[in-house]
């Protein structure tokens, strides 16, 4: 008789999840010599231990602490790039500007990027059929709690000028319900962070509006200012040219506004 299994609203665990995490861990240590002390088998065990045999709606930050410890990493605190709803461009940017880091440029972010995972209460099985959806099922699911935990730690580590890339094509350029809006903004440390600089990325070629005047950006400025952190904002009118100029800053066309 097949065992009854909870049906969740979200997609199930990414196929070959354990192998993917292990392979990514090894790949990361290959690229980043400073992380070669990392024991990828222990990393997988700690990752697995955070959600296996636990109810996937009852995961806590505490469950991830062994993994957090194994993945402890020092990134230059003044070279942090946060992003919201514009991951691909943020990653393209840090691939060119190698001294800046998104969360997914750290070991733990790299391991979990674009993956889904969950287990089942009281069994050692990984659920490949379905996992809880943040809205439709529960917020304390393995994936959401993981990103909340690593995002909080990443924001807490930031100092000096912190940059955030925001998607100017969205109806809410700054969304209080995003990970940036609900976690990272509130965990920047005013005693360490002097300024949050927002880069609003324009979508349309002919879009010459000053999106720094958008009401949601003003809301972000208000939240940040109340936390005793300065705020500044820049429009990135042409993201393609922006990336090109990061690659080749000497290019004569890069002196004009991008």
């Amino acid at each position: 008789v097949p065992r009854w299994r909870q049906q969740w609203s979200g997609p199930g665990t990414t196929k070959r999840f354990p192998e993917t995490v292990l392979a990514r861990c090894v790949k990361y240590t290959e690229i980043h010599p400073e992380m070669r002390h990392v024991d990828c088998q222990s990393v997988w065990d700690a990752f697995k231990g955070a959600f296996i045999s636990k109810h996937p709606c009852n995961i806590t930050e505490e469950d991830y602490q062994p993994l957090m410890k194994l993945g402890t990493q020092t990134v230059p605190c003044n070279k942090i790039l946060l992003w919201s709803r514009i991951k691909d461009l943020a990653h393209q940017f840090t691939q060119v500007q190698r001294d800046m880091f998104t969360l997914e440029d750290t070991l733990l972010g790299y391991l979990a990027d674009d993956l889904t995972w969950c287990g089942e209460f009281n069994t050692s099985k990984i659920n490949y059929q379905s996992c809880p959806d943040w809205r439709k099922d529960c917020s304390n699911n393995p994936v959401s709690v993981f990103w909340k935990t690593v995002s909080r730690r990443f924001a807490e580590a930031a100092c000096d000028v912190v940059h955030v890339m925001l998607n100017g094509s969205r109806s809410k350029i700054f969304d209080k319900n995003s990970t940036f809006g609900s976690v990272e903004v509130h965990n920047l440390q005013p005693e360490k962070v002097q300024t949050l600089e927002a880069w609003v990325i324009h979508g349309g070629r002919e879009d010459s509006r000053d999106l720094c005047q958008d009401p949601t950006i003003k809301e972000l400025e208000s939240i940040i200012s109340k936390r005793n952190i300065q705020f500044s904002c820049k429009n990135i009118y042409r993201p393609d040219k922006f990336l090109q100029c990061v690659k080749n800053p000497e290019d004569s066309s890069c002196t004009s506004e991008i």
Partner: antibody, heavy 121, light 107 residues
């Protein structure tokens, strides 16, 4: 099959520099993810990790001995060389080289047979 | 540096006995502990890594467990070829450090 073999002097005088060579087969340090480390063991005592080197020339040393140690590799000869300056009788030990592999952090899975180095005047 | 303390330093046992060796780390090393077997005049042989993973070719009578600071190597049924010295090693951080060894002798 991976094999490693240590070679070098069996006797060195105090204050001299020790040069040890690890020659290996079935392993290439031009292959991503591979490394070779050195460990020593004084007679009747425990093991002590000294240093290791990765395929991309990334090196790590035991901080307590760092000022005296240099590790290098010659990929074409399949060799790793450890030099240790200012030898002292307390450095008398069997010196081993061993393989390390990325992802298992610093787990040494294949070891050489070891070479006994005596420091005495 | 992380100190690795093994106990006992030596033990006497008979063939067929269940033998347990413990290792305590001076700080949390999660599960980054390896165990080695060494016979006189020979190089150490890897038995267990990452606390509980048996290395290729190691007999199933050898098992490892533990996490955090306390780790155990168990030989479920001691064989004549198992009389040797056993070392634990933390592979969590540099400098890599070893325990002082546990000598398993014939009773």
């Amino acid at each position: 099959q991976v094999t490693l073999k240590e070679s070098g002097p069996t006797l060195v005088k105090p204050t001299q520099t020790l040069t040890l060579t690890c020659t290996f087969s079935g392993l290439s340090l031009s292959t991503s993810g591979k490394g070779v480390g050195w460990i020593r063991q004084p007679p009747g005592k425990a093991l002590e990790w000294l240093a290791h080197i990765w395929w991309d020339d990334d090196k790590r040393y035991n901080p307590a001995l760092k000022s005296r140690l240099t590790i290098t590799k010659d990929t074409s000869k399949n060799q790793v060389v450890l030099t240790m300056t200012n030898m002292d009788p307390v450095d008398t030990a069997t010196y081993y080289c061993a393989r390390i592999e990325l992802g298992r952090s610093y787990v040494m899975d294949y070891w050489g047979q070891g070479t006994l180095v005596t420091v005495s005047s | 540096d992380i100190q690795m303390t093994q106990s006992p330093s030596s033990l006497s046992a008979s063939v067929g006995d269940r033998v347990t060796i413990t290792c305590r780390a001076s700080q949390d090393v999660i599960t980054s502990v390896a165990w080695f077997q060494q016979k006189p005049g020979k190089a150490p042989k890897l038995l267990i890594y990452s606390a509980s993973y048996r290395y290729t070719g190691v007999p199933s009578r050898f098992s490892g467990s533990g996490s955090g600071t306390d780790f155990t190597l168990t030989i479920s049924s001691l064989q004549p070829e198992d009389f040797a010295t056993y070392y634990c090693q933390q592979h969590y951080t540099i400098p890599l450090t070893f325990g002082q060894g546990t000598k398993v002798e014939i009773k």
